[in-house]
Interface confidence: medium
């Protein structure tokens, strides 16, 4: 396959509600009509797939119903949002982009976005 450059932010801090958003941008060498975006999580040298979506250019990304990811696309940028994150989910989240159609097939893998998740402090007990 052919290589393609993918850029993503180095660090993102999740919100107190466990939501993290980042942009994944790819340098498309041609006029792709079908693109697949996959988010991978690397932690302790293990890589697992978090979510994936295939979309037609100009259309919305469609993740599976039970996915923790949502996203929108604009040109060669994909805005990804990961929800339901907890402190244990802190790790390097890698954006992988594949230009599926038309040929040739291009593959690009970003350097990863370190997402930090801090669990909110529980509210102190109150007698009131």
């Amino acid at each position: 396959c052919k290589a393609m450059h993918v850029a993503q932010p180095a660090v993102v801090l999740a919100s107190s509600r466990g939501i993290a958003s980042f942009v994944c941008e790819y340098a498309s060498p041609g006029k792709a009509t079908e693109v697949r975006v996959t988010v991978l999580r690397q932690a302790d040298s293990q890589v697992t797939e978090v979510c994936a979506a295939t979309y037609m250019m100009g259309n919305e990304l469609t993740f599976l119903d039970d996915s923790i990811c949502t996203g929108t696309s604009s040109g060669n940028q994909v805005n990804l949002t990961i929800q339901g994150l907890r402190a244990m989910d802190t790790g390097l989240y890698i954006c992988k982009v594949e230009l599926m159609y038309p040929p040739p097939y291009y593959l690009g893998i970003g350097n990863g976005t370190q997402i930090y998740v801090i669990d909110p402090e529980p509210c102190p007990d109150s007698d009131f």
Epitope: C1, G30, T33, E34, M56, E98, M100, Y101, P102, P103, P104, Y105
Partner: antibody
Framework: EVQLVESGGGVVRPGGSLRLSCAAS????????MSWVRQAPGKGLEWVSG????????GYADSVKGRFTISRDNAKNSLYLQMNSLRAEDTALYHC?????????????????WGQGTTVT | DIQMTQSPSSLSASVGDRVTITCRAS??????LGWYQQKPGKAPKRLIY???SLQSGVPSRFSGSGSGTEFTLTISSLQPEDFATYYC?????????FGQGTKVEIK
């Protein structure tokens, strides 16, 4: 046995329409991209159009863009080519061909299985 | 679009001869090239894919080589059934494009 059988060819006046069909058998049809390739009398091979495994993406040669439409019905193991606004230069033998692609649509190795063709005049 | 220039357009050879056909791409296509044989009234048959990989069932006298823009099909010892027209096809980028063809005739 892996087989592709084309039909639907015939004689048509300039400006007319025709719909070609290709029936596939002997392989899992929706694992493969498909193409139409034509050959004018006494001439070489010309790729006309291609479609990916699920019909979601298509491609066309400049010579037919806007006039021809490729489609497929995976439930019927069939490929189609709707040809509108036909011209004299579209006269050819039209072959249906299977794309030798890895993992449905990641990488293409050209066409490995061909039908005998149907004639459009 | 990628243009494929095939040469020669025709050649005469005898049984047992070594035959070489070349194909030149207008831009680099890595090894994304196939070779096809076509006999009159028949569908094309793939001989070589990915520039040098032999299609299953094809005799080993057929071989392919090259990468980038220059490619070669070689028939090491021409047999009577090899008299046909040969085409190269780039399968790197849409639209797929074929060479003009090389007709191999009996001398």
């Amino acid at each position: 046995e892996v087989q592709l059988v084309e039909s639907g060819g015939g004689v048509v006046r300039p400006g007319g329409s025709l719909r070609l069909s290709c029936a596939a058998s002997g392989f899992t049809f929706d694992d493969y991209g498909m193409s139409w390739v034509r050959q004018a009398p006494g001439k070489g091979l010309e790729w006309v159009s291609g479609i990916n495994w699920n019909g979601g993406s298509t491609g066309y040669a400049d010579s037919v863009k806007g006039r021809f439409t490729i489609s497929r019905d995976n439930a019927k193991n069939s490929l189609y080519l709707q040809m509108n606004s036909l011209r004299a230069e579209d006269t050819a033998l039209y072959h249906c061909a299977r794309e030798d692609n890895w993992r449905k649509y990641y990488y293409y190795y050209g066409m490995d299985v061909w039908g005998q063709g149907t004639t459009v005049t | 679009d990628i243009q494929m220039t095939q040469s020669p357009s025709s050649l005469s050879a005898s049984v047992g001869d070594r035959v070489t056909i070349t194909c030149r791409a207008s831009q680099g296509i890595r090894n994304d090239l196939g070779w096809y044989q076509q006999k009159p009234g028949k569908a094309p048959k793939r001989l070589i894919y990915a520039a040098s990989s032999l299609q299953s069932g094809v005799p080993s006298r057929f071989s392919g080589s090259g990468s980038g823009t220059e490619f070669t099909l070689t028939i090491s010892s021409l047999q009577p059934e090899d008299f046909a027209t040969y085409y190269c096809l780039q399968h790197n980028s849409y639209p797929w494009t074929f060479g003009q063809g090389t007709k191999v005739e009996i001398k």
